[in-house]
């Protein structure tokens, strides 16, 4: 990125000239390349700092900025210098500093293993119906049924590899088309992006590390959307990655591969296979309607097994219905016909917490769930602790210069690039884009990433994600081959071209403003974050989902009302921000609107009330529970018994939110609220944790 | 030792009724399924039709419904064949016999045979 | 129905020859064919089924072959016990249906 212009000699007067900024205020630009700037969150919003009047940069550029809170912060380093200590006290540091490692990367292990976990955890509460909704044999015939039960099934079972192996495996039994296979494809990616999002919740504690890590979190969501939402009407108007992927797979001979390495897998499998073990296949098996599988439990009991071909004696209803001609007969009675038949001896049980337990998948499910994201919670508060004391003073500079700064003109539209590939290559490794961009989030919230820069990285890991998937399907049987194949090609083919949409123009990145838009206004109003995830990953799917299986007229009825408002809204928007003269001047703002639905804070109100029933007794108990009553109410009075908050309600005492110029939101009403021009809501009933 | 006995000969009157058994012993009844089969003229055979004891199923061959009924009893394990508006062309020696049920192992035990003459 | 066929009303033999006896089925059984023997004032008694299995207690010299529509029963060494009539039948599909039978005499 180009640095923001300044004039080299010219020196800041030392009585601070300060004024109220009259109008609105120009986008800062990201300035963290260059500077590391204090977060100052207590800074008042709204003013801007003026040059002396010698300075001939303030007659030709515009006020300096605003105190961006997209700005990295500087992590402050309290400690002795290295200089400055006696031999035990460097051998001290020494170990101090292989303690933090080896805390580091334990609490890494176990929120990768947590990660896991949730998976199986969701796997169980929604398997069977994520199952069931790939029976749905409307999915043929409407992409966009596709397109949200691919977002479903990835959200119920929290894994895109686990919903894409379930398509590839109705496509090689003819269940489905590759074609009908794209859609859900296209929605499986939408919702594996949700685990980094539930990551970015948990530190909702401080305000402007939640702004970043949200918003670093949701880049990946406003990706996946608008690629679809460009994407999936192309695909349905004219094939292109069906033909491309069919043209590849057609001209190539491929012969089995070996199996995708498992890296990470390697080391937490022995862990992770001690909680809990499930039965994969039995999803797979609801999806291509197999009756006896909805009976059937997902936590696997038994891992050794002996199996036994045999023949049995069916009847069958005519003889035409026989499996082998010459097997065929009849006693007069019945037609009958020789099945073979796979019996399995149970020799050995697995060796996990719930293989004796006999508990329903569902209770089985919800523990795991609460448990995995207690530990997914613990592990990123100490993974952030950690990683704040050792990146201080001159660490942090080194790792965020190398991360964050550009390669040298002319060179530095390469730099993305690079992180592209390093996003890939690290999810390759990984074996899993959740993980990485999981991985990411508090590395973003912490500071240390700019959003800037982990966009390229999100890209990258999506890509990552698909060669994984290549790898996979080179590795299957012959009659899955070909499908798998195709169908891992479609979700590369659609995430490059994703990649050419949203971001070779820095003009066209509109995932980051779109997410740092979500990051002003969820760090504003927290609620609001955990109202986005579930609004973006079950409502509106499940509402489309609904709608399709009323029908098409139905689906169009309501769609096209839904879709022209929102057309107009936008267009409304751009006219207002571009040229408000050609609007008559009522429609030059959104002031005609009622207060609810131009701003959130009425919403907030309600949901404070909402709230409060829980505020008096809902979390007393420890630092994690703090948390989540923050990102619920809004409300350090909840917190009184528990002096994490109490000390933290202190420090926040009189703190609003900066924020960027308006231009990041679509509703300019929301964007005055969160800079503060609109009256904020009494600061007694804001709380921030941890 | 597996037995299939059937009961002595029938004279019979045109337009009557005749009811032949078959008691069996020596195997499980209900895992089995009884045939009848007649034989005229002392050469052709020709199945009349079958019943699975267990579930009381029955088939029959097109030309002998409504002319054969064949019924089972578990609790004698004797099954029985009714031959009804007897004709003397139904005059002929008919035979009960097993059927492993869900095998292919075909007729592997008869009963020694009922004569039955029609004649006015 | 499936008619079966055998074309042979009557098969001269002496003791200790090989004899074969056949059966056409008038469509495909695929191997769904018993062999029956009856003496004269007996039950009939099986002696092959699904075409080439021997039934428990059979001599080894009846040996049955064939599957689709030609079948045959076979028995070498011929013993004076075994001048009998020999039924085929069908048991691919209902009704069950005989052939008409194949007397074997001494010549």
């Known amino acids: 990125m180009a640095p923001w212009p300044e004039l080299g000699d010219a020196q800041p007067n030392p009585d601070k000239y300060l004024e109220g900024a009259a109008g609105q205020q120009p986008t800062a630009p990201d300035k963290s390349k260059e500077t590391n700037k204090t977060d100052n969150t207590e800074a008042p919003v709204t003013k801007i700092e003026l040059l002396p009047s010698y300075s001939t940069a303030t007659l030709i550029d515009e006020p300096t900025e605003v105190d961006d809170p997209w700005n990295l912060p500087t992590l402050q380093d309290s400690g002795i210098k290295w200089s400055e200590r006696d031999t035990k006290g460097k051998i001290l540091c020494f170990f101090q500093g292989i303690g933090r490692l080896i805390l580091l990367l334990g609490f890494l292990y176990f929120f990768v293993c947590s990660l896991d976990i949730l998976s199986s955890a969701f796997q169980l509460v929604g398997g069977k119906m994520a199952g069931q909704f790939f029976s749905n044999s409307s999915i043929m015939s409407n992409p966009l049924l596709g397109l949200v039960i691919g977002v479903l099934v990835t959200v119920l079972v929290q894994s895109s590899s686990t919903s894409t192996s379930i398509v590839v495996s109705m496509v090689s039994s003819s269940l489905l088309t590759v074609r009908a296979a794209i859609p859900i494809i296209m929605g499986a990616n939408i919702g594996t992006s949700i685990t980094n999002t539930i990551v970015a919740l948990m530190q909702v504690g401080d305000r402007s590390e939640f702004r970043r890590a949200f918003a670093g979190a949701t880049v990946h969501d406003f990706f996946n959307w608008l690629s679809v939402l460009v994407l999936l009407p192309v695909e349905v108007a004219t094939h292109y990655l069906e033909i491309i992927t069919q043209l590849i797979v057609e001209s190539f001979h491929f012969k089995n591969g070996e199996d995708a390495p498992d890296l990470l897998k390697v080391i937490t499998k022995p862990f992770t296979k001690l909680i809990v073990q499930l039965d994969k296949k039995v999803i797979s098996q609801i999806a291509m309607n197999d009756e006896k599988a909805k009976n059937k439990s997902l936590v696997k009991i038994w891992c050794k097994t002996f199996t036994n071909k045999t023949q049995i004696n069916v009847t069958v209803p005519s003889t035409a219905n026989c499996t082998s001609p010459s097997l065929c007969w009849t006693d007069g009675i019945q037609n009958w016909t020789m099945k073979n038949v796979t019996y399995k001896e149970n020799i050995a049980k697995c060796q996990h917490i719930f293989v004796n337990f006999h508990l329903p998948d569902l209770a089985v499910g919800t523990i795991l769930l609460i448990l995995s994201l207690l530990v997914l919670c613990g592990c990123l508060i100490m993974i952030v602790k950690i990683l704040g004391s050792v990146l201080k003073g001159q660490v942090a500079t080194v790792i965020k210069k190398t991360i964050n700064t550009d390669f040298p003109f002319p060179f530095a539209w390469l730099t993305g690039y690079l992180a592209i590939l390093v996003g890939a290559g690290m999810t390759f490794i990984v074996q899993s884009s959740s993980v990485f961009t999981s991985a990411l989030t508090p590395l973003i919230g912490i500071g240390v990433i700019t959003i800037e820069r982990a966009y390229p990285l999100t890209l990258g890991s999506n890509i990552g994600t698909t060669t994984t998937a290549i790898l996979a399907a080179l590795a299957s049987p012959g009659n899955a081959l070909r499908s798998s194949l195709q169908i891992a090609l479609c979700h590369f083919f659609f995430n490059i071209s994703g990649i050419l949409l949203w971001y070779p123009i820095p003009f066209t990145r509109l995932p980051i403003r779109m997410a740092k838009g979500l990051g002003n206004i969820s760090a504003k109003y927290r609620w609001f974050a955990v109202f986005y995830l579930i609004i973006f990953f079950f409502l509106i799917p499940l509402t489309v989902f609904g709608l399709s299986l009323a029908g098409w007229r139905v689906l169009v009825g309501v769609g096209v009302p839904v879709v022209f408002i929102i057309i107009l809204v936008l267009c409304l928007r751009l006219l207002q921000s571009r040229c408000p003269r050609v609007l008559p001047k009522k429609l030059q703002n959104w002031n005609f609107l009622p207060l609810w639905m131009r701003s959130l804070k009425p919403w907030d109100a309600v949901v404070s009330k909402f709230t409060g029933c829980f505020q008096m007794r809902c979390c007393c108990c420890c630092r994690v529970c703090c948390r989540a009553c923050c990102l619920l109410c809004d409300c350090p009075k909840c917190c009184r018994c528990s002096k994490c908050c109490e000390d933290l309600e202190e420090a926040q005492e009189g703190q609003d939110v900066p924020v960027k110029a308006p231009e990041t939101f679509d509703n300019i009403t929301i964007s005055r609220e969160a800079q503060g021009e609109v009256p904020a809501s009494d600061s007694k009933t804001e709380c921030t944790a941890l | 030792e597996v037995q299939l006995q059937q009961s002595g000969p029938e004279l019979v009157k045109p337009g009557t009724s005749v009811k032949i058994s078959c008691k069996t012993s020596g195997f499980f009844f209900t895992e089995y399924i009884i045939h009848w089969v007649k034989q005229s003229h002392g050469r052709s055979l020709e199945w009349i039709g079958g019943?699975?004891?267990?579930?009381?199923?029955?088939n029959y061959k097109q030309n002998f419904r409504g002319k054969a009924a064949l019924t089972a009893d578990k609790s004698s394990n004797t099954a029985y064949m009714e031959l009804r508006s007897l004709t003397s062309e139904d005059s002929a020696v008919y035979y009960c016999a097993r059927w492993r049920n869900a095998y292919y192992s075909a007729m592997d035990s008869w009963g020694q045979g009922t004569s039955v003459t029609v004649s006015s | 129905d499936i008619v079966v066929t055998q074309s042979h009303k009557f098969m001269s033999t002496s003791l200790g020859d090989r004899v074969s006896i056949t059966c056409t089925a008038s469509?495909?059984?695929?191997?769904?064919v018993a062999w029956y023997q009856q003496k004269p004032g007996h039950s009939p008694k099986l002696l092959i089924y699904w075409a080439s299995t021997r039934h428990t207690g059979v001599p080894e010299r009846f040996t049955g072959s064939g599957s689709g529509t030609d079948f045959t029963l076979t028995i070498t060494n011929v013993q004076s016990e075994d001048l009998a009539d020999y039924f085929c039948?069908?048991?691919?599909?209902?009704?069950?249906?005989f052939g008409v039978g194949t007397k074997l005499e001494l010549k």
């Open positions: 469509q495909d059984v695929g191997t769904a």
């Open positions: 019943i699975i004891p267990n579930n009381d199923v029955t």
């Open positions: 039948q069908q048991y691919r599909t209902s009704p069950l249906t």
